[in-house]
Interface confidence: low
């Protein structure tokens, strides 16, 4: 799996999970989240050569097409596969609210 | 939806469905498929600016992050959303076989 266990241990130019810390205020301009101040969102990036973690038959076809026609702009892309929620604390007036924001943290990637 | 009805009628630089015809023999080197000789596979391509058909909360976060930090390589990518199968005819010896290859045709796209 193209997850932290594999990607963070290996230097990998192909599609893989990349570390990314997001500071809510600085990076997103969000001032409404009280805790946490930021989180390890991670992201997916890298090339998608033929058969590198292809998600569907179409992405396998596309990567093979791209191998034979390298000038074509039609190629698979490295995107998130498994995502996890993030629990946040914010306030409505003086009332604290705890909420779980779904699909906030990328855990693994795929070529799609 | 970023499908043919929208994308093929509009000149759209952002993430959208793009037409792509694939000839099995010429483009993939596949000689085993008897019929069809090729098919309209389509593909997804284009920029994913903030809130352009974002698939998940993470992709919305990433596109907002990319707006504020446009030099960062962390950005959502335009990938397939809905896919359809393709029915093919091939031979094992002299015996014709009809099979449905799943997820071969892209019908719509998303920013993920």
């Amino acid at each position: 799996a193209l997850d932290a266990a594999y990607c963070f241990r290996n230097v990998q130019d192909n599609c893989c999970l990349r570390p990314l810390y997001i500071d809510f205020k600085r990076d997103l301009g969000w001032k409404w989240i009280h805790e946490p101040k930021g989180y390890n969102a991670n992201f997916c990036a890298g090339a998608c050569p033929y058969l590198w973690s292809s998600d569907t038959q179409h992405s396998r076809v596309l990567s093979l097409y791209n191998t034979i026609n390298p000038e074509a702009s039609a190629s698979p892309c490295c995107v998130s596969q498994d995502l996890e929620p993030l629990t946040i604390l914010y306030y409505i007036g003086k009332t604290p609210k705890i909420e779980q924001l779904s699909n906030m943290i990328v855990k693994s990637c795929k070529c799609s | 939806a970023l499908d043919a009805a929208y994308c093929f009628r509009n000149v759209q630089d952002n993430c959208c469905l793009r037409p792509l015809y694939i000839d099995f023999k010429r483009d993939l080197g596949w000689k085993w498929i008897h019929e069809p000789k090729g098919y309209n596979a389509n593909f997804c391509a284009g920029a994913c600016p903030y809130l352009w058909s974002s698939d998940t909360q993470h992709s919305r976060v990433l596109s907002l992050y990319n707006t504020i930090n446009p030099e960062a390589s962390a950005s959502p990518c335009c990938v397939s959303q809905d896919l359809e199968p393709l029915t093919i005819l091939y031979y094992i010896g002299k015996t014709p076989k009809i099979e449905q290859l799943s997820n071969m045709i892209v019908k719509s796209c998303k920013c993920s």
């Epitope: 599609c15 990036a45 998608c48 | 600016p49 446009p70 030099e71 390589s73």
Partner: antibody, heavy 122, light 112 residues
Framework: QSLEESGGRLVTPGTPLTLTCTVS????????VNWVRQAPGKGLEWIGY?????SAYYASWANGRFTISKTSATVDLKITSPTTEDTATYFC???????????????????WGPGTLVTVSS | AAVLTQTPSPVSAAVGGTVSISCQSS????????LSWFQQKPGQPPKLLIY???TLTSGVPSRFKGSGSGTQFTLTISDVQCDDAATYYC????????????FGGGTEVVVK
């Protein structure tokens, strides 16, 4: 995929000048384009860029002295009030596509235009 | 604003020999690897050799090698050829400041 600068010429100090970078083979709504200059016999100097989304960013020394804007196929660099120190060859360069995401850069500028020479003299 | 300091010019190298050029940044580059190396010959625009600190651009000979992370980077040219005579620049990408990019002062390589 190529870029070409135009508009470089001899101008007198204080006369505004607009340089144009014409692109072909790619869309400006998918790529960020930078302006870089090089004074005669000197090194490269990053001026600023306009992102695929249309936001312009400038080096702190260039803020107020330059304005970057774009149309569907061109990126303009306006030198608001040229001085003799602005004499240089001006290049436009695209962020290279890294992996599958066209907005990625990793400080990789490729391709570049051939450059256009601006001479500021009284 | 970040300052990139390169090995003083000129650096002399013999054909077949090895030359190393250092590039030191006054602050960490983005993601510790937003560092590129360019080659420039008189009358020509710069040519991208290496990006992401160590990734070789397509078509660039493997004699060119980039290394380093954070604030300290090195370009090594092994088996130096006459055609390698040029000025080499490093460029760094930065987050959070208005100065998103900066170039080093350049290092001239003279081949004997």
């Amino acid at each position: 995929q190529s870029l070409e600068e135009s508009g470089g010429r001899l101008v007198t100090p204080g006369t505004p000048l607009t340089l144009t970078c014409t692109v072909s083979g790619f869309s400006l709504s998918s790529y960020t384009v930078n302006w870089v200059r090089q004074a005669p016999g000197k090194g490269l100097e990053w001026i600023g860029y306009i992102s695929y989304g249309g936001s312009a960013y400038y080096a702190s020394w260039a803020n107020g002295r330059f304005t970057i804007s774009k149309t569907s196929a061109t990126v303009d660099l306006k030198i608001t009030s040229p001085t003799t120190e602005d004499t240089a060859t001006y290049f436009c360069a695209r962020h290279m596509q890294v992996g599958g995401a066209p907005t990625g850069s990793m400080a990789a500028f490729d391709p570049w235009g051939p450059g256009t020479l601006v001479t500021v003299s009284s | 604003a970040a300052v990139l300091t390169q090995t003083p010019s000129p650096v002399s190298a013999a054909v077949g020999g090895t030359v190393s050029i250092s590039c030191q940044s006054s602050q960490s580059v983005y993601n510790n690897n937003y560092l590129s190396w360019f080659q420039q010959k008189p009358g020509q625009p710069p040519k991208l050799l290496i990006y992401g600190a160590s990734t070789l651009t397509s078509g660039v000979p493997s004699r060119f090698k980039g290394s380093g992370s954070g604030t300290q980077f090195t370009l090594t040219i092994s088996d130096v050829q006459c055609d390698d005579a040029a000025t080499y620049y490093c460029a760094g990408g930065y987050s959070g400041s208005s100065d998103k990019y900066a170039f080093g002062g350049g290092t001239e390589v003279v081949v004997k």
